[in-house]
């Protein structure tokens, strides 16, 4: 079996700044080098919009749902059919392949399984799933996710998103 862990599941970054989404894994055996697949899924709800209207009816409903199910995350838990899903990058051995949508972007998988954006862009906000599979169990469900929010330089949103912390601001 393969155990996949994302040690820091929340990231807030300023537009055009770099960010690395860390992912680690442990394998019980090494049949062949594992395949690392990073997938992007759009948020089920707009996190930034909710941050600016915390008293909305929807947010109150979400709070009630979360109270009944402490593990419920309304931004992440919805069917793929109602959101955008893309392969960001895959890594097999030392070869990294970008998904079609990300061709030309300065994105790579560094280390064993970390996803690195040299420069974030509008549209990068969402949920990133790190999946690690063996060559002979490609459909294995061994994944963990990180949420990424990309904010404009003038936004005050980082202060309004409890549980998130902004990454270093670099020029």
């Amino acid at each position: 079996a393969i155990q996949v862990t994302v040690p820091d599941p929340y990231h807030v970054v300023i537009l055009f700044q770099p960010v690395t989404l860390h992912c680690t894994y442990q394998m019980s055996n090494t049949l062949t080098a594992p395949i690392v697949i990073w997938k992007y899924k759009s948020f089920c709800r707009d996190r930034v919009a909710d941050a600016f209207s915390p008293a909305s009816v929807d947010n109150q409903l979400n709070a009630q749902l979360a109270a009944g199910n402490p593990g419920y995350n309304p931004y992440v838990e919805c069917q793929d059919s109602v959101r955008t899903v893309r392969v960001v990058a895959t890594k097999q051995g030392n070869a990294v392949t970008l998904g079609d949508y990300y061709q030309g972007r300065r994105i790579t998988i560094t280390g064993n399984a970390d996803l690195t954006f040299e420069q974030t862009a509008w549209g990068d906000s969402g949920v990133y799933y790190c999946s690690v599979v063996s060559a002979q169990d490609l459909d294995g469900n061994n994944e963990a996710y990180a949420e990424l929010i990309v904010l404009g330089r003038t936004s005050e949103a980082p202060e309004l998103l409890p549980g998130f912390r902004a990454g270093p601001l670099e020029d």
């Epitope: 055996n29 049949l31 395949i35 997938k39 097999q92 998904g99 063996s134 002979q136």
Partner: antibody, heavy 115, light 106 residues
Framework: AVTLDESGGGLQTPGGALSLVCKAS????????MQWVRQAPGKGLEWVTG????????RYGSAVKGRATISRDNGQSTVRLQLNNLRAEDTGTYYC????????WGHGTEVTVST | ALTQPASVSANPGETVKITCSGG????????YGWYQQKSPGSAPVTVI????QRPSDIPSRFSGSTSGSTATLTITGVQVEDEAVYIC?????????FGAGTTLTV
Amino acid sequence: AVTLDESGGGLQTPGGALSLVCKASGFDFSSYEMQWVRQAPGKGLEWVTGISGSGSSTRYGSAVKGRATISRDNGQSTVRLQLNNLRAEDTGTYYCARGSTIDAWGHGTEVTVST
Amino acid sequence: ALTQPASVSANPGETVKITCSGGSSYAGSYYYGWYQQKSPGSAPVTVIYYNDQRPSDIPSRFSGSTSGSTATLTITGVQVEDEAVYICGTYEDSGGVFGAGTTLTV
């Protein structure tokens, strides 16, 4: 040595159900996706269904979707195919196969669906 | 469905290449295997899996490669006992897919 032994084939009646079992040995069973592939007489190979190593994910070919169920018991190193509402076109040799891109095959078990 | 030539022929000692195309990617990559069937109804034997991996009991004259969505099986120094049907298979989002097979006559 890797071995995959299928059982459960034979003469079946249309509309009935069959249960095929594949017993695996010689490898770390839970690390491999397992597949069922069939071959009708005089025809090519047809993928039927597959199940991930943990058993958490299953997929089915269009010809059997809604009629087939694949399951596995990692403790017993077995994978089972249940196929309901049998049709004449389900006739053929059913192979158990190891891996996402298959690296080992069983000897096959023949299934005949006929009145 | 996967596309491969219906038949190829070669003399012993020659190099044979069989191509397979039409597969779809799975999570951004392509995954192919090659299977040898010596007679109808006999169990297939894997000669290449995971694009270019060869099972330990398969002779080194068999090799596999991929370029984009096309896979190639190469038999370097083909032998009479290699005469068989070679079937390519791939792994994609919808499940497994096989080609109709290529009959190799030596």
